[in-house]
Interface confidence: low
């Protein structure tokens, strides 16, 4: 019978860690000579297995090749790794007497695609917090997957974002691949509760994409709006001043009251009110004993937020000398912000 080497499968796909069978059958055992499996072609091809009884890690012959009538030279590769990817050839040799064995026929080859899952995506953002209306970049990285085809999508609060750049490396053929993608996000003051999500879909993930998440609360700073107001006096000798810092994030806040430029009270906020958008509010009360002030007094509320330059708001309380009614004091708010860069 004429010799024919048949590899029925043109390709097989196998998940990393699993086993795969590479089928090879012969129509004749003649001429006498060994059968060998190679990966690749040409001088650099790699001998994978020869049915000579030697031990090869992870590779077994499927049938008993020691039987005289055996025509099945299929092999099983166990615990496949991405390094096993390539085209495998079942090759028949004719035994030489004094000269080396001669290759006489090869199967058509079976390409092994190793399916390796991508690593969970890691999303990184800027080192410093950004402010509303600022554009910031986020990068998503995943590695170790095969085959090369992969889909990466960006979302912010459910809306898909278009990346600036997405690259899969290496560009040539390799055992496994890495993906890196960068997206640009414009921050807004409502973003404290927002998330940027990087979603990776791959053939190995069975329609369950992997997600990497960046909470924008880690990357945004919303500066407070600061207001000083005067409450109705509780008694004839007291003026109640209120300094309100509204809609700020993160929580780090220091508040100082000054009288005519001198520090009067340090207020370290403890009970902040949280808004539904994730920002915070804080109200500081300052009781002024009006009978102690015959002259005008400028009260200043100075707010330092997240190590940023201080925001100041002034409020002038007129002393008794200006008052026709000895039992009351007049006040003049001055709510224009002045920035103290010290």
């Amino acid at each position: 019978k004429e010799l024919k080497v048949t590899q029925p499968e043109k390709s097989v796909s196998v998940a990393a860690g699993d086993s795969t069978v590479l089928n090879c059958t012969l129509t004749s055992l003649l001429p006498v000579g060994p059968i060998r499996w190679y990966r690749g072609v040409g001088p650099s091809r790699l001998l994978i297995y020869s049915f000579a009884g030697e031990y090869v890690p992870r590779i077994r012959n499927v049938s008993d090749t020691t039987k005289r009538n055996n025509m099945d030279f299929s092999i099983r590769i166990s615990n496949v790794t991405p390094a096993d990817a390539g085209i495998y050839y079942c090759v028949k040799f004719q035994k030489g007497s004094s000269e080396p064995d001669t290759e006489i026929q090869s199967g058509g080859g079976t390409e092994v695609y190793v399916l390796a899952k991508p690593s969970p995506p890691e999303v990184s953002g800027p080192a410093d917090r950004g402010i509303p209306d600022q554009k910031v970049n986020f990068t998503c990285k995943s590695h170790g997957f095969s085959p090369r085809n992969i889909t990466l999508k960006w979302f912010k609060d459910g809306q898909e974002l278009h990346p600036l750049e997405t690259t899969v490396n290496p560009s040539g053929k390799n055992v496994s691949y890495n993906i890196s993608s960068t997206v640009r996000v414009v921050l807004n003051s409502m973003d404290v509760n927002s998330k940027v999500i990087c979603e990776v879909a791959h053939i190995t993930l069975d329609r369950s994409p992997l997600r990497g998440i960046a909470n924008l609360s880690n990357f945004i700073r919303v500066s407070p709006t600061v207001k000083v107001t005067q409450q109705s006096p509780t008694s004839m000798n007291q003026v109640n001043l209120t300094c309100r810092a509204e809609r700020f994030y993160p929580e780090d806040l220091q508040l100082i009251w000054l009288e005519n430029g001198n520090v009067s009270r340090n207020d370290t906020p403890k009970n902040l009110t949280k808004n539904t958008d994730g920002t915070y509010n804080y109200t500081s009360l300052f009781l002024v004993n009006s009978s102690a002030h015959r002259e005008d007094v400028v009260f200043t509320c100075q707010v330092k937020h997240d190590q940023q330059p201080a925001i100041t708001r002034n409020h002038t309380v007129l002393g008794f000398a200006h008052s026709s009614d000895q039992g009351s004091m007049q006040t003049f708010p001055d709510n224009n912000a002045t920035h103290n860069w010290n």
């Epitope: 890690p57 166990s78 790794t81 991405p82 390094a83 390796a116 899952k117 170790g144 496994s176 890495n178």
Partner: antibody, heavy 119, light 107 residues
Framework: QVQLQESGPGLVKPSQTLSLTCTVS??????????WSWIRQHPGKGLEWIGA???????YYNPSLKSRVTISVDTSKNQFSLKLSSVTAADTAVYYC???????????WGQGTTVTVSS | DIQMTQSPSSLSASVGDRVTITCQAS??????LNWYQQKPGKAPKLLIY???NLETGVPSRFSGSGSGTDFTFTISSLQPEDIATYYC?????????FGGGTKVEIK
Amino acid sequence: QVQLQESGPGLVKPSQTLSLTCTVSGGSISSGGYYWSWIRQHPGKGLEWIGAIYYSGPIYYNPSLKSRVTISVDTSKNQFSLKLSSVTAADTAVYYCSKEGYHSGMDVWGQGTTVTVSS
Amino acid sequence: DIQMTQSPSSLSASVGDRVTITCQASQDISDYLNWYQQKPGKAPKLLIYDADNLETGVPSRFSGSGSGTDFTFTISSLQPEDIATYYCQQFAYLPWTFGGGTKVEIK
């Protein structure tokens, strides 16, 4: 002849992260065909496989430790490393790195490094 | 996880005795089993891979056999330098798991 050498702090405080590095000499970590594993042994106890990494990316972790373990490889330094977060006294052990040929046996081991978790 | 049950946990034998250790897997692991020797204060050393293959440089008095769920490790003639703890390890399924070990002592 491939040789392995573990390095890292011998004392780690509870709740901190244990970080160890295994330096490979006598061969290239990126030559392929091998997994690089971490194994630990609690005092007077048996061996526990932590996880393994293939140079090009695939990583396998023991599910019992997966939430706390990170194994990574640095081919430029011919090293692979282990990070174990939120450690407790139960993580006190001798930590070994090993080379595993095609999952057919851990044929090369480091000498082991003792890590004690204590405040 | 695959459970590897090793027995006995310890044994004492005389120099020249034949020593046998068994290892049972909780499910079929084919021949994906290794045996290691660990001496006090030292790293484990691979002796047998794939159930019955002797690692290069390991004395021929060590041997392994078995397939499926039941495996045996044998020292045909115990030597003083064989005092150690011996472990089996499966690598058929992740995570790799070890037996509890068998401590071998000289009578």
